[in-house]
């Protein structure tokens, strides 16, 4: 039940892209503050964002310790200026978040086409391997490092003069596609984790077209 002048947080929502993970909730505080705790299913609670008036808390540092674990968070409500005050049961008011498994649920960020190079009737398109905040041996891992072959990229490519999009797929960060000589093509890529049932796809990368400075053309 809690004290009469605090309300429990509600609409606890995980917002996560490429493992950058923020817990959001409502309401905007009026004469109250919040503290967040996070734990794995079997672990101890760790407090974050102490006595904040924000309605979000960045939990990235905690979840990147093991992205395959399932996490639970809870948001405590305290009266402003009297954080020792507790509810009628002797505990501050709190609300639990939904469970969150970063590896299965983090959204895939918008990919970027790093470069493309044409050699005759072949074009090699390279996707930037985006850095995440997941660390191993004190270095930040890339998206490919974390997901390995679970992550594929779909390339959409089309003649500048036409609308139909052909597709190619790769479980590396490179595509090698056949093109018609003398035609300019445009490209867009999408990250996909086919083994997922939700949050399977990223938004599309910005479109890059031949004849612009990202690419290189070599006639063989």
């Amino acid at each position: 039940s809690g004290t009469t002048n605090t309300v429990a947080a509600y609409n606890l929502t995980w917002k996560s892209t490429n493992f950058k993970t923020i817990l959001e909730w409502e309401p905007k505080p009026v004469n109250q503050v919040y503290t967040v705790q996070i734990s794995t299913k079997s672990g101890d609670w760790k407090s974050k964002c102490f006595y904040t008036t924000d309605t979000e808390c960045d939990l990235t540092d905690e979840i990147v310790k093991d992205v395959k674990q399932t996490y639970l968070a809870r948001v405590f409500s305290y009266p402003a200026g009297n954080v020792e005050s507790t509810g009628s049961a002797g505990e501050p008011l709190y609300e639990n978040s939904p469970e969150f498994t970063p590896y299965l649920e983090t959204n895939l960020g918008q990919p970027t086409i790093q470069s493309f190079e044409q050699v005759g009737t072949k074009v090699n398109v390279t996707v930037e391997d985006e850095r995440t905040l997941v660390r191993r041996n004190n270095t930040f891992l890339s998206l490919r490092d974390v997901f390995g072959k679970d992550l594929i990229y779909t390339l959409y490519y089309w003649k500048s003069s036409s609308s139909g999009k052909k597709t190619a797929k790769t479980n590396t960060n490179e595509f090698l596609i056949d093109v018609d000589k003398g035609e300019n093509y445009c490209f867009s890529v999408q990250a996909v984790i086919p083994s997922r049932t939700v949050n399977r796809k990223s938004t599309d990368s910005p479109v890059e077209c031949m004849g612009q400075e990202k690419g290189e053309f070599r006639e063989i």
Epitope: I152, T154, Y156, S163, K165, Q190, V192, P194, T197, R200
Partner: antibody
């Protein structure tokens, strides 16, 4: 349970139009790619075209290009095949199928099909 | 477009027979070949993906293999419910293309 249900088939005159629907349940179409495949009576399977509902990208078989248009309404979780300037050779059972977009990416679920007959 | 040439177009066999159907791609398609089974009045059903992987729920008497651009579907011991038409499909490039089909009939 994943399900695809086609509807909208029927008898139409040459030169006429028809719109087929493919209603999906058990998954969100914007997370997948949806294909249309047809089968003329007593014949084999012919790919018609695809749509990626997440971005609206499409591609069509040469035999239908300029006459058929695939679209999707993600709020209704439904894909559509708009068929214009229909010809006798478009007579077929039309199937929609789900593509999980994996590297091995075959069509893992198909609808039951809807028959389109083009005849005067 | 990549052509998938399937043979034979039909075959007669008895229950318990070993049946082999082949598909040849007109160019390299890596392992991006699937096999489907279709019964009259029904939609195709996925049997094999990535040339040799058995799809979930498909009996182990079905198998697939690849040698270069040649792909084979084998039914080790034909069962009464296996009498149907079988199609190969490449999904390596757009447009995806199907073989012409092989009808497996009762001898």
């Amino acid at each position: 349970e994943v399900q695809l249900v086609e509807s909208g088939g029927g008898l139409v005159q040459p030169g006429g139009s028809l719109r087929l629907s493919c209603a999906a349940s058990g998954f969100t179409i914007s997370d997948y790619v949806i294909h249309w495949v047809r089968q003329a009576p007593g014949k084999g399977l012919e790919w018609v075209g695809y749509i990626d509902p997440s971005n609206g990208y499409t591609y069509y078989a040469d035999s239908v290009k300029g006459r058929f248009t695939i679209s999707a309404d993600t709020s209704k979780n439904t894909a559509y095949l708009q068929m214009n300037s229909l010809r006798a050779e478009d007579t077929a059972v039309y199937y929609c199928a789900r593509d999980p977009q994996s590297l091995t990416s075959p069509f893992d679920y198909w609808g039951q099909g809807t028959l389109v007959t083009v005849s005067s | 477009d990549i052509q998938m040439t399937q043979s034979p177009s039909s075959l007669s066999a008895s229950v318990g027979d070993r049946v082999t159907i082949t598909c040849r791609a007109s160019q390299d398609v890596n392992t991006a070949v699937a096999w489907y089974q279709q019964k009259p009045g029904k939609a195709p059903k996925l049997l094999i993906y990535s040339a040799s992987f058995l799809y979930s729920g498909v009996p182990s008497r079905f198998s697939g293999s690849r040698s270069g651009t040649d792909f084979t579907l084998t039914i080790s011991s034909l069962q009464p419910e296996d009498f149907a038409t079988y199609y190969c499909q490449q999904h390596y490039t757009t447009p995806p293309t199907f073989g012409q089909g092989t009808k497996v009939e009762i001898k």
